[in-house]
């Protein structure tokens, strides 16, 4: 038969950040190629990445149609040089992926501090709202558009001259914190979805930004400096 020398894929793994979603698997093909199918629990199978020699397939376009659905994928193995034959009755070997629910399982990408502004003893820190590939009509939605109040940010901040960290939380993308006059502070933020129960509740920390550098200035006069 045409499939006797093909090996079923294994270690099917979803890699997803901010809804950019790729299915990966093994092994690296020797004399075989792969086709991926994806489906919701109640839907039909849709084929993607036809007869590819890669061991990954970008399924973002499919999952962003409904990020709150649960998806299943499967990877079929075919002999290299395989051409679809209508007369073929033998099903090629395949392996199923774990189920994947994007809304619950996509990792939160590393956030970025967009700007900070000091007025007297207050500092306003703004987190950049990341764009996703999720659409409403023909408009791409931001992370906040998709997650709404499910998404919060934690701010870590500390005096440049010491190591003692303080924290603040917001369910918007802005923090307003009290600081000591004349002190420079450093900031880092983390995206969090508190209602998740797994390791992907939190993003990695943003790069650290410190006052007196290019993203913002300490100004007693109340002037603002935005980083563009």
């Amino acid at each position: 038969s045409g499939t006797t020398n093909t090996v079923a894929a294994y270690n099917l793994t979803w890699k997803s950040t901010n809804f950019k979603t790729i299915l990966e698997w093994e092994p690296k093909p020797i004399n075989q190629v792969y086709t991926v199918q994806i489906s919701t629990k109640s839907g039909d199978w849709k084929s993607k990445c036809f007869y590819t020699a890669d061991t990954e397939c970008d399924l973002t376009d499919e999952i962003v149609k409904d990020v709150k659905q649960t998806y299943l994928a499967r990877v079929f193995s075919y002999p290299a040089g395989h051409v679809e034959s209508t007369g073929s009755t033998e099903e090629p070997p395949y392996e199923n992926s774990p189920e994947f629910t994007p809304y619950l399982e996509t990792n939160l990408g590393q956030p970025t501090i967009q700007s900070f502004e000091q007025v007297g003893t207050k500092v306003n820190v703004t987190v950049q709202d990341e764009w996703t590939l999720v659409r409403r009509n023909d408009t791409f939605l931001s992370l906040r558009d998709v997650f709404g109040k499910d998404l919060i940010y934690t701010l870590y901040y500390w005096k440049s001259s010491s190591s003692g960290k303080k924290t603040a939380k917001t369910n918007t993308n802005e923090f307003l914190i009290d600081v000591d006059k004349g002190e420079n502070y450093c900031f880092s933020v983390q995206a969090v979805i508190p209602s998740r129960r797994t390791a992907n509740r939190k993003s990695t920390d943003s790069p650290v930004e410190c006052m007196g550098h290019e993203k913002g200035e300490s100004r007693e006069t109340g002037h603002h400096h935005h980083h563009h």
Partner: antibody, heavy 120, light 113 residues
Framework: EVQLVQSGSELKKPGASVKVSCKAS????????IEWVKQRPGQGLEWMGD????????NYNENFKGRATFSADTSVSTAYLQISSLKAEDTAVYYC?????????????WGQGTLVTVSS | DIQMTQSPSSLSASVGDRVTITCKSS????????????LTWYQQKPGKAPKLLIY???TREEGVPSRFSGSGSGTDFTLTISSLQPEDFATYYC?????????FGQGTKLEIK
Amino acid sequence: EVQLVQSGSELKKPGASVKVSCKASGYTFITYWIEWVKQRPGQGLEWMGDILPYSGSTNYNENFKGRATFSADTSVSTAYLQISSLKAEDTAVYYCARSGYYGNSGFAYWGQGTLVTVSS
Amino acid sequence: DIQMTQSPSSLSASVGDRVTITCKSSQSLLSSSNQKNYLTWYQQKPGKAPKLLIYWASTREEGVPSRFSGSGSGTDFTLTISSLQPEDFATYYCQNDYTYPLTFGQGTKLEIK
């Protein structure tokens, strides 16, 4: 088709407890918040709180903390509202609703409501 | 908590009229990160569950007639019905969907004149 079907009317005595169920169908139950809303006769709507069935995570309106408890059984796609130590002012229609698809996009689907009457 | 205040509390109008209901929040419902206002409008008829009309202050829910429109930003919002139909006589509620606890306005009852 998304549907939320609630349990039937209840008549309870003061001090008793009641458990209202909300059976969901037509969508992925675990990924949407189930909201609970109280409406006393002839009055407006009051948000009680919500639960995300996936994790059991809850938010409560302070006015209902302590006596109201939300739970969900994902195996039967059903959410529950339990109210203990019932008082006359708990007489109301209780609605379950499902959050919208997008973030903060309202309560898109509603159950038919369950009338709870508290009377001695 | 964010307080939601609707006006008027009741309103009499005729079929074909243009009707406006206002809603004020005690704090801004504008998310600075994505410039969306998290204000929702519902319609409720006697003995029935509420029905979602408008979310994000101005986005009509699927299937809602185009005569319903929402506008406003920050703390001041408006629901407009451009030409009243017999089935529009009901009570209308606005809701803060921005931050917990979620809060409703007291309602505006729209009656036939």
